[in-house]
């Protein structure tokens, strides 16, 4: 029961995490204009991995995509790559983990196969989470560096009176979404790896032992251990896992043809 719960929770946490990584990657607010001494601005700039946007006080918002590939900073390209790798690994991990879930029966899949799949998806989630955290952290580092560089030459004089105020950028909402999402995916992956240990079949085989009493021939097969751990074919236990411990949302999430309640 604990293994199934750990596996299920790991899957859900990873699912939320990967959804968050996708959301962060698509978000426009990776960096936002620093409003240091002017909290009310007529023109507000913010940038994402794919486009930069300007929101005017008038309510008008204009976004422009980065249509060049070679002209973009190498760091931005690296961040994009890390986030995409994170999403791809996470998506594959989700696909693998769906089939690895204890509560879903596909044909006569062995427990050892499910354990291997759980471990594989767990590792994928861990790498996916690390990619997202790395990507967001690289971008954050880039922002911090640029922030202090622009602060150093905040006002560049242009012939006495005239001033050019340099726009400084600070952390946007996407960074925090990315960090949290990466962390969740990582935690989910660890949970899947922990669940894998419990899913692996026991090495010791409890063979049937015959006890011969005088006058009667009664064979006693101890099946209690297997039944209590939930790894046996005890239908009563199976019903609890499949029916009782599942929410309506989970029922919708998995195709009915794989459910044997």
């Amino acid at each position: 029961m604990a293994v199934t719960a750990c596996q299920g929770l790991g899957f859900v946490v990873s699912l939320i995490g990967i959804a968050g990584i996708i959301a962060a990657t698509c978000m426009d607010q990776w960096s936002t204009q620093d409003l240091y001494n002017n909290p009310v601005t007529a023109v507000f700039n913010y940038q994402g991995l794919w486009r930069s946007c300007v929101r005017e006080s008038s309510g008008f918002t204009e976004c422009r995509g980065y249509f060049t590939l070679l002209g973009l900073p190498a760091m931005l390209q690296a961040v994009r790559a890390l986030m995409i790798v994170g999403i791809v690994l996470g998506a594959i991990g989700l696909l693998v983990s769906i089939f690895a879930l204890k509560c879903i029966r596909i044909g006569s899949m062995e427990d050892s196969a499910k354990a291997n799949m759980t471990l594989t998806s767990g590792i994928m989630f861990i790498v996916s989470g690390l990619c997202a955290i790395a990507g967001v952290s690289v971008f954050a580092n880039m922002l911090v560096t640029n922030f202090w560089m622009s602060t150093a030459n905040m006002y560049t004089g242009m012939g006495g009176m005239v001033q050019t105020v340099q726009t400084r950028y600070t952390f946007g909402a996407a960074l925090f979404v990315g960090w949290v999402a990466g962390g969740l995916t990582l935690i989910g992956g660890v949970m899947m790896c922990i669940a894998c240990r419990g899913l692996a079949p026991e090495e010791t085989n409890y063979k049937a032992v015959s006890y011969h009493a005088s006058g009667h021939s009664v064979a006693y097969k101890p099946g209690g251990f297997k039944a209590s751990t939930g790894f046996g074919s005890n239908t009563k236990n199976k019903k609890i896992y499949d029916g009782g411990a599942r929410t309506e949302d989970e029922v919708q999430s998995y195709p009915s043809k794989h459910d044997y309640v």
């Epitope: 002017n38 023109v43 930069s52 726009t167």
Partner: antibody
Framework: DVQLQESGPDLVKPSQSLSLTCTVS?????????WHWIRQFPGNKLEWLAY???????NYNPSFKSRISISRDTSKNQFFLQLKSVTTEDTATYYC???????????WGQGTLVTVSA | DIVMTQSPSSLTVTAGEKVTMNCKSS????????????LTWYQQKPGQPPRLLIY???TRESGVPDRFTGSGSGTDFTLTISSVQAEDLSLYYC?????????FGAGTKLELK
């Protein structure tokens, strides 16, 4: 089409408060855009005073400090300007306006002339 | 606050003539985010509110004749009327649309010779 109409007193005594109303038709003030107050002195100089955001938050010209306040009544589709402790320097034509692309003002009221005199 | 300086304060012209008026800001009105200059031009006739002519320094508002052209970048801007008509004789203002408080120039008065 969007129309704005200012209303308020023609004459205000010094040290008193000036209250102006802008009635908007053809668009909801809580729908979108920012709604502004601008004044024009007798010598034609224009000065931006304040704005009321569609969300209800406001922003003021810092030169007025705590002398100015802006509010609204969404049920009547009106927004208001209050200027406290007026002096003869506040004699001007007061306009309400709605912002447009580029933070420009496309829609203006006809303006109301307010004279501050004892 | 950004100070807007308009020159000349008045211009005497003849119909059909090309007219140029200038506006200078104390700070750059260029926004690197969208590569646009936040300067607006208005025309005002006596007893009327200002009328929007040009925003983003060079974008003509719909209904504005194409004889009106806005140009410039950063801190120096120009409004050009290619061939002045009698109805163009009025006051012209430039406005800082880049940062609060929004500020206006003192205006350029266009008069007939």
């Amino acid at each position: 089409d969007v129309q704005l109409q200012e209303s308020g007193p023609d004459l205000v005594k010094p040290s008193q408060s000036l209250s102006l109303t802008c009635t908007v038709s053809g668009y909801s003030i809580s729908g979108a855009y920012n709604w502004h107050w601008i004044r024009q002195f007798p010598g034609n100089k224009l000065e931006w005073l304040a704005y009321m955001q569609y969300s209800g938050s406001s922003n003021y010209n810092p030169s007025f400090k705590s002398r100015i306040s802006i509010s609204r009544d969404t049920s009547k589709n009106q927004f208001f300007l209050q200027l406290k402790s007026v002096t003869t320097e506040d004699t001007a034509t007061y306009y309400c306006a709605r912002m447009y692309n580029g933070n420009s003002f496309l829609y203006w009221g006809q303006g109301t002339l307010v004279t501050v005199s004892a | 606050d950004i100070v807007m300086t308009q020159s000349p304060s008045s211009l005497t012209v003849t119909a059909g003539e090309k007219v140029t008026m200038n506006c200078k800001s104390s700070q750059s009105l260029f926004n690197s985010g969208n590569q646009k200059n936040y300067l607006t031009w208005y025309q005002q006739k006596p007893g009327q509110p200002p009328r929007l002519l040009i925003y983003w320094a060079s974008t003509r508002e719909s209904g504005v004749p194409d004889r009106f052209t806005g140009s410039g970048s950063g801190t120096d801007f120009t409004l050009t009327i290619s061939s002045v008509q009698a109805e163009d004789l009025s006051l012209y203002y430039c406005q800082n649309s880049y940062s609060y408080p929004l500020t206006f120039g003192a205006g350029t008065k266009l008069e007939l010779k």
